[in-house]
Each structure stands twice: as structure tokens, then as C-alpha cells.
Interface confidence: medium
């Protein structure tokens, strides 16, 4: 798995403190939880709760641990081999196309739609048209489930719980 690593992702360079474990690189790579020394001779362990590395690597620095934003809860802490796992608070969600923030879930469906999916930390509520309703003319919707809107379209509010 490859990832673009930007300068701000990297923890500030620090000299190897005495408590940091060292080992030798294997074929030029250091194991998860370590980074390589500047001279390439040693693997230096990441600092628990501060930085991490998830794969065999030749990084000069471990990656900085993510801090959960306000509006997020920490599901699991950062370890030397795994980044912090953050999740949106109840009633909010993070979309794939806008992962930078948690957004408030919508409060309900429009008339004529039913809620088929609840608010989760990764998705808004899901609303779909009532495919079984009748058209305003009194006809049953055709196979393609076409519905036309009009003031007379049968409709009832869906649950407003988020």
C-alpha cells in the first residue's frame, strides 16, 4: 500500500534517545514501528503516542500521530504501528468526498420519501421515494417506478429521528 507523505506528516527530527530501541535494517528497510537512521545503519523505534509507521519502510522519520478534532471521538489510540482511529460523534458523519470534517446528519426525509438508512459516523441518513405509492392521477407507478410530484401526490412525513 503506498501513500503520499508530506513534510507536515512527519514528526520533527529528533536524535535517538537512549530509550529508543535500535535494530538493523533488513535489505535497507525497517519494520513497522520503526524508521531508518540517517546513515542507514539502524532502525529506530517510533515513539508511542507520538508517531508511528505501519509498513516496512526507509523513512527518515516516523509519521506523526493524528489528533482527533473536536467533534470526533477517539476509537483507538496511536501506537507505534498504527495511527489514531477517530470517528465522528453521534449525529454527525464524515463523507468520502469531504473527509476533512464531520458534518451534521440531516434530521429527516421529505414528504413522499422514507428513511431506509440511519445516520452513522460514515454516512448521512438515506431517503428513498415511496416506490409503492400511487401517482397523483391515481395510476400505479410503472415498472420503472416513475413518480410525478404534485400537490396531490400521496405523502406522509417520514421519521424525523436522526
Amino acid at each position: 500500500e503506498s501513500a503520499l507523505i508530506t513534510q507536515q506528516d512527519l514528526a520533527p527530527q529528533q536524535r535517538a534517545a537512549p530509550q529508543q530501541k535500535r535494530s538493523s535494517p533488513s535489505e535497507g528497510l525497517c519494520p513497522p514501528g520503526h524508521h531508518i537512521s540517517e546513515d542507514g545503519r539502524d532502525c529506530i523505534s517510533c515513539k508511542y503516542g507520538q508517531d508511528y509507521s505501519t509498513h516496512w519502510n526507509d523513512l527518515l522519520f516516523c509519521l506523526r500521530c493524528t489528533r482527533c478534532d473536536s467533534g470526533e471521538v477517539e476509537l483507538s489510540p496511536c501506537t507505534t504501528t498504527r495511527n489514531t482511529v477517530c470517528q465522528c460523534e453521534e449525529g454527525t458523519f464524515r463523507e468520502e468526498d469531504s473527509p476533512e470534517m464531520c458534518r451534521k446528519c440531516r434530521t429527516g426525509c421529505p414528504r413522499g420519501m422514507v428513511k431506509v438508512g440511519d445516520c452513522t459516523p460514515w454516512s448521512d441518513i438515506e431517503c428513498v421515494h415511496k416506490e409503492s405509492g400511487t401517482k397523483h392521477s391515481g395510476e400505479v407507478p410503472a415498472v420503472e417506478e416513475t413518480v410525478t410530484s404534485s400537490p396531490g401526490t400521496p405523502a406522509s412525513p417520514c421519521s424525523l429521528s436522526g
Epitope: 421529505p110 431506509v116 431517503c127 428513498v128 421515494h129 420503472e144 416513475t146 401526490t153 405523502a155
Partner: antibody, heavy 118, light 107 residues
Amino acid sequence: QLQLQESGPGLVKPSETLSLTCTVSGGSISSRSNYWGWIRQPPGKGLEWIGNVYYRGSTYYNSSLKSRVTISVDTSKNQFSLKLSSVTVADTAVYYCARLSVAEFDYWGQGILVTVSS
Amino acid sequence: EIVLTQSPATLSLSPGERATLSCRASQSVSSFLAWYQQKPGQAPRLLIYDASNRATGSPARFSGSGSGTDFTLTISSLEPEDFAVYYCQQRSDWPLTFGPGTKVDIK
């Protein structure tokens, strides 16, 4: 980042059918959470919702246009289309495609001006 | 159908001033109201959904309030890029309808 792009002829003759396609990139049209819609805006005027479609093909139309509108979806091409029949000069507008999140339009195409003229 | 009325039609203000835009619905739409910004030659952009929730990328100076039939969009301090047309849209019932818009222009 999700992007939508309208395409089709910019000039349609009166009484003919206006046909537009919206291509979705950066995301799947087969999302269970979203409908895909068309909105139009006559020059210098406000916005009018035309209708929307679900990836399974179910459609919902504005009753003021229902007799002339067909919206369809092609999930294999990540596209959805608008057909508006028997057009008149009053159908001259910028036509936008957009994604509906529940029932607000959170991603829009840049719009395509369609002029109805002989 | 639910008719939305926006006022004023035009609002002339200077950068740095506070803008207050109104949207009134012909019947209750609960909190199911959105606000959009449209600049000349561009598509509308979602600013606020469900009356008061800021959409992704919407600056903090934009805030929405109201429920039922009366809604307000407030721009706390106008930036040069905020001069545009603002539309409200209801999603309480079908057809989805938009207000006629309020143009915010430079005094």
C-alpha cells in the same frame, strides 16, 4: 472530489427534443445515499427543479414538466440523462445536473446553455 | 407546491458589513431549508442545509436560522467574494422549490 459535467447540443429547434447527458466522475452514481437531478435557470431568472433519478432507475419529476420529461440513468457509464420533448422558446435556459444529498443539491455541474430557436 | 419568498430582492452593502437575508415559505417546511450562493456565470453552491448546518467548505461567517415558515441567512462580515445572488430551497415536500433570490451587491 466528485465532479459532474453536462454535455449536449447548445441549440435546439422549437418542437424538437432537448437531450442532455451528465457524466459523474470521482464517485459512483450507484450510491445508495444519493439521487441525481436536473435543474434549469432561464437567463436572468431563478432556479427550477426538473426532476431526479435513482441509480436503480426510479424517477421523480416536477409535475409542471412531467408530460415532457424523461430522466434515465446508465450506471455502466456513470451517467444520467435528460430528455425534454416539444420544446419552445420558454425552455431556453442554463441546464444544470446535480447530486442530491437527501434533497439538497450539494454538487453541481457547471451548467450548459441550451437555446431554443429556429 | 410550496412557494418561497425572499426579501429584500436586492441588498446593497459594503465589505465588512453584516448582511441579513430573509426567506419565507407559504407553509411550514420544518427545518428543511437550504441556502445557495450563485456568482455570475457559475453554478449555485450549497452553503447551508437543514436551516442552520454549514455545508462542506462553507465559511464560518455564513450562518442560518429559523424554522417553520421564516428563515434567515446571515453573513457576519461581508468579504468581496460574498457579493452574489442567494437562493433558498425547501425540501419538505415535492416539487422541490427555490426562492426567487436575493442579490447582494456592493454599495
